[in-house]
């Protein structure tokens, strides 16, 4: 196996590799730096393995995976001591590296010249006490949201930031605005930003308006 790659968004984590097997099956093992090698996806002919269940046990740990290649049938392809061939993955630290999924604007409410914009708190597959944690539960204040907003009638964008899931912004009375948000973890060196949320504009279903 080669090109072992971690594909992870909001902690949903898949290990992918190549090639599509012809005369092989694969078994994946995952470990923390100090822990056990735990086998997953036994004797599979797939070229991906869902490792979410393992990494969510502790998202701040650093994980390593390896893919064992077993020759199918009587194909001889083992190492010198009869050991199966395997390839190591790059290290992966979910807390630092999982991609931030595209956020969603849950609602916005206008009261006079103020608009309150609320970002949906995405549920992750990370559990605590048998409850799934939200993105905010996991990242706390490390996670901020950037709001981009503009008058429907112009293209000039303004920005606001929050370390909660809510924005309170000033708007011009009588004007319609459009909004988009982005999740950001400023302390990261990689995968710092999510893609922008779908644009939501005032005058659509998600909004409430009060004088």
């Amino acid at each position: 196996a080669f090109n072992l790659t971690w594909i992870s968004t909001d902690f949903k984590t898949i290990l992918e590799w190549q090639p599509k097997p012809t005369n092989y099956t694969y078994t994946v093992q995952i470990s923390t730096k100090s822990g056990d090698w735990k086998s997953k996806c036994f004797y599979t002919t797939d070229t991906e393995c869902d490792l979410t269940d393992e990494i969510v046990k502790d998202v701040k740990q650093t994980y390593l995976a390896r893919v064992f290649s077993y020759p199918a049938g009587n194909v001889e392809s083992t190492g010198s001591a009869g050991e199966p061939l395997y390839e190591n993955s790059p290290e992966f630290t979910p807390y630092l590296e999982t991609n931030l999924g595209q956020p969603t604007i849950q609602s916005f409410e206008q009261v006079g010249t103020k608009v309150n914009v609320t970002v949906e708190d995405e549920r992750t597959l990370v559990r605590r006490n048998n409850t799934f944690l939200s993105l905010r539960d996991v990242f706390g204040k490390d996670l901020i949201y950037t709001l981009y907003y503009w008058k429907s009638s112009s293209s000039g964008k303004k920005t606001a930031k929050t370390n909660t899931n809510e924005f309170l912004i000033d708007v011009d009375k009588g004007e319609n605005y459009c909004f988009s948000v982005q999740a950001v973890i400023p302390s990261r060196t990689v995968n710092r930003k999510s893609t922008d949320s779908p644009v939501e504009c005032m005058g659509q279903e998600k909004g409430e308006f009060r004088e």
């Epitope: 078994t27 056990d36 036994f42 004797y43 002919t45 049938g73």
Partner: antibody, heavy 121, light 107 residues
Framework: QVQLVQSGAEVKKPGASVKVSCKAS????????MHWVRQAPGQGLEWMGI????????VYAQKFQGRVTMTRDTSTSTVYMELSSLRSEDTAVYYC??????????????WGQGTMVTVSS | DIQMTQSPSSLSASVGDRVTITCQAS??????LNWYQQKPGKAPKLLIY???NLETGVPSRFSGSRSGTDFTFTISSLQPEDIATYYC?????????FGGGTKVEIK
Amino acid sequence: QVQLVQSGAEVKKPGASVKVSCKASGYTFANYYMHWVRQAPGQGLEWMGIINPSGGITVYAQKFQGRVTMTRDTSTSTVYMELSSLRSEDTAVYYCARGGSKVAALAFDIWGQGTMVTVSS
Amino acid sequence: DIQMTQSPSSLSASVGDRVTITCQASQDISNSLNWYQQKPGKAPKLLIYDASNLETGVPSRFSGSRSGTDFTFTISSLQPEDIATYYCQQYNFHPLTFGGGTKVEIK
């Protein structure tokens, strides 16, 4: 109910081959791996290999490489284990055992009744 | 191959006794271990999977635990129908391997 029914006892001469069948019923054949495990008289259990009924892919224990062939017939939900170049130490009860699907643990939850293979000149 | 060292190889206990069997792996196998019961002339039967999970329909007097590379199988109160040979089996590394078995008899 879920069951595995194996073919009857065999007596073979050294150097010959034996082919044991295992017919599955009561579950979706393609969804579960099938393993072969053998047990020599008065001895412990020894894993021989695995077949994925879905694609027919097999993986064998190194000890049996070159002598064992596992196949399946999806139309009859049957797996086969053929062992060639038999020797006296191959005298054993051969079991087929259902294992997990590709994401499940490799625990053998359903076993065939066993097929006694005697190798004697 | 991973060696599974099972002990004792045989034991004799009275009905109602607590019976403990151990299995030691030659290297770390995480919790990838199963326990089977085999009665004379019969196929093995799965009792415990993933070191400590009871298979459906298996009486709660059977249990399993793990401490590092040491695995313990316990019968909390031995019953006459528990007379059998018990095997551990690891599946964390290829090839899958079994312990040598423990024969349990009634005193």
